[in-house]
């Protein structure tokens, strides 16, 4: 028996369902009574789901996994993972034994889009050209860690005096805070781009300083 899985990682959004594809080619006359199917976490060997003894043994992984029972006899050993969490990320091994056996691993990459950044300025009044200001760009609830880029109004990257921190919350999602310290010109626009490297999703925020008032 030859097991086939997708070579590319499966990308799943947090709180959505994901399908880890695994298939085998059953011989003519194949019956489910002959099938032993085991899904494990590749690294720890923890059991995720199994089909043995002619029956679905059920989820062994937080009761969020399911097979496709009607498709098993056709050689579809795929695993459905419901309500994906950050902690589900990793490699899963699909092991199939009929008369002989084979296994293959499929990777799950979890992702969550970042929110539109909010911009704050300190100080935020009585600003004069030549003042040093701190601009903070905050974006929330994304995964994995973001890439943050700053640009001025002409699109020129601002790399000096940037401090970016990323903190994971209890769900493993990241809140990003990036601080740019800059000397004000006569007027200017400062843009922050928060990029999710897996989703290739960009979230933009900007602040324009034109004397008073400020526009965000």
């Amino acid at each position: 028996v030859e097991v086939q899985v997708s070579e590319d990682p499966v990308v799943a959004l947090v709180d959505t369902d994901a399908t880890l594809r695994c298939s085998f080619s059953p011989e003519p006359g194949f019956s489910l009574a002959q099938l032993n199917l085991i899904w494990q976490l590749t690294d720890t060997k923890q059991l995720v789901h199994s089909f043995t003894e002619g029956r679905d043994q059920g989820s062994a992984y937080s009761n969020r996994t399911a097979l496709f029972p009607d498709l098993l006899v056709q050689g579809n050993a795929s695993l459905r993972l419901q309500r994906v969490r950050v902690t589900d990320e990793g490699s899963y091994t699909c092991f199939v034994s009929i008369q002989d056996f084979d296994s293959a691993a499929v990777s799950l990459q979890v992702a969550a889009p970042y929110s539109k950044p909010s911009m704050t300025l300190e100080p935020n009044k009585d600003l004069r050209p030549g003042n040093m200001v701190t601009i903070t760009c905050s974006s929330y609830q994304g995964y994995p860690e973001a890439e943050v880029f700053w640009k001025d109004g002409q699109g020129v990257p601002l790399t000096g005096n940037v401090t970016t921190s990323q903190m994971a919350n209890e769900r493993g999602l990241f809140d990003v805070h990036s601080v740019l310290r800059v000397v004000l010109g006569a007027n200017g626009t400062y843009s922050c781009l928060v990029r999710n490297p897996v989703l290739q999703q960009d979230a933009h925020g900007s602040v324009t300083i034109t004397g008073q008032p400020l526009t965000f």
Epitope: N36, K45, Q46, L47, S50, G58, A60
Partner: antibody, heavy 123, light 107 residues
């Protein structure tokens, strides 16, 4: 008939080494995961280590990690356990056991066991 | 690690009695629980796997039930050869862990 026969046990001083062997017969050895389970005198059973059919996966109990090494020779139908830096608490009967499938870990319970070999660590 | 707790630790029974041994896991092991019988100086012998599947060659008086965290091994009519120590083992995740054993003695 599935048969597993352990050998290599004996008396060894603390800090010493032993190599246990398990000769398998009555089944296609290379189609199954294998493992070692031990039982201290008058005590219960403790899983020690497991190895997959092709030796690609090897797992160890925390209590022996870094000291014990599991291996297999499919051409000789033999399972091994190299035990180094032995301690008094390693004193036990060591059983060789067959996993019911080729892989190890979750879902791969042991279905056949050998009679065991006694390892005594004492000065 | 998953902790397995068996009860009772020992029991006395007579031939023909119905005997029940329980095993509790510290977290769900789904259906991946096995029962072994061990006689003095002998190797453990698999009786039940996947909670309720009877191993080939094991008498039908042995049965298993349960799911998740609570499991039971039942011997419907105890026979002289059944006096032994019984262990449960979870095989959901490594390290595999065993109950402390239940010794079944002759009353």
């Amino acid at each position: 008939e599935v048969q597993l026969v352990e050998s290599g046990g004996g008396l060894v001083q603390p800090g010493g080494s032993l190599r246990l062997s398990c000769a398998a017969s009555g089944f296609t050895f290379s189609d199954y995961g294998m493992g070692w389970v031990r039982q201290a005198p008058g005590k219960g059973l403790e899983w020690v280590s497991s190895i997959s059919w092709d030796s690609s996966s090897k797992e160890y109990a925390d209590s022996v990690k870094g000291r014990f090494t599991i291996s297999r020779d499919n051409s000789k139908n033999t399972l091994y356990l190299q035990m180094n830096s032995l301690r008094a608490e390693d004193t036990a009967v060591y059983y060789c056991a067959r996993a019911w499938i080729a892989i190890i870990g979750g879902g791969a319970h042991f279905d056949y066991w050998g009679q065991g070999t006694l390892v005594t660590v004492s000065s | 690690d998953i902790q397995m707790t068996q009860s009772p630790s020992s029991l006395s029974a007579s031939v023909g009695d119905r005997v029940t041994i329980t095993c509790r896991a510290s977290q769900s092991v789904s259906s991946h629980l096995a029962w072994y019988q061990q006689k003095p100086g002998k190797a453990p012998k698999l009786l039940i796997y996947l909670t309720s599947s009877l191993q080939s060659g094991v008498p039908s008086r042995f049965s298993g039930s349960g799911s998740g965290t609570d499991f039971t091994l039942t011997i419907s009519s105890l026979q002289p050869e059944d006096f032994a120590t019984y262990y449960c083992m979870q095989s959901k995740s490594l390290p595999f862990t065993f109950g402390q054993g239940t010794k079944v003695e002759i009353k």
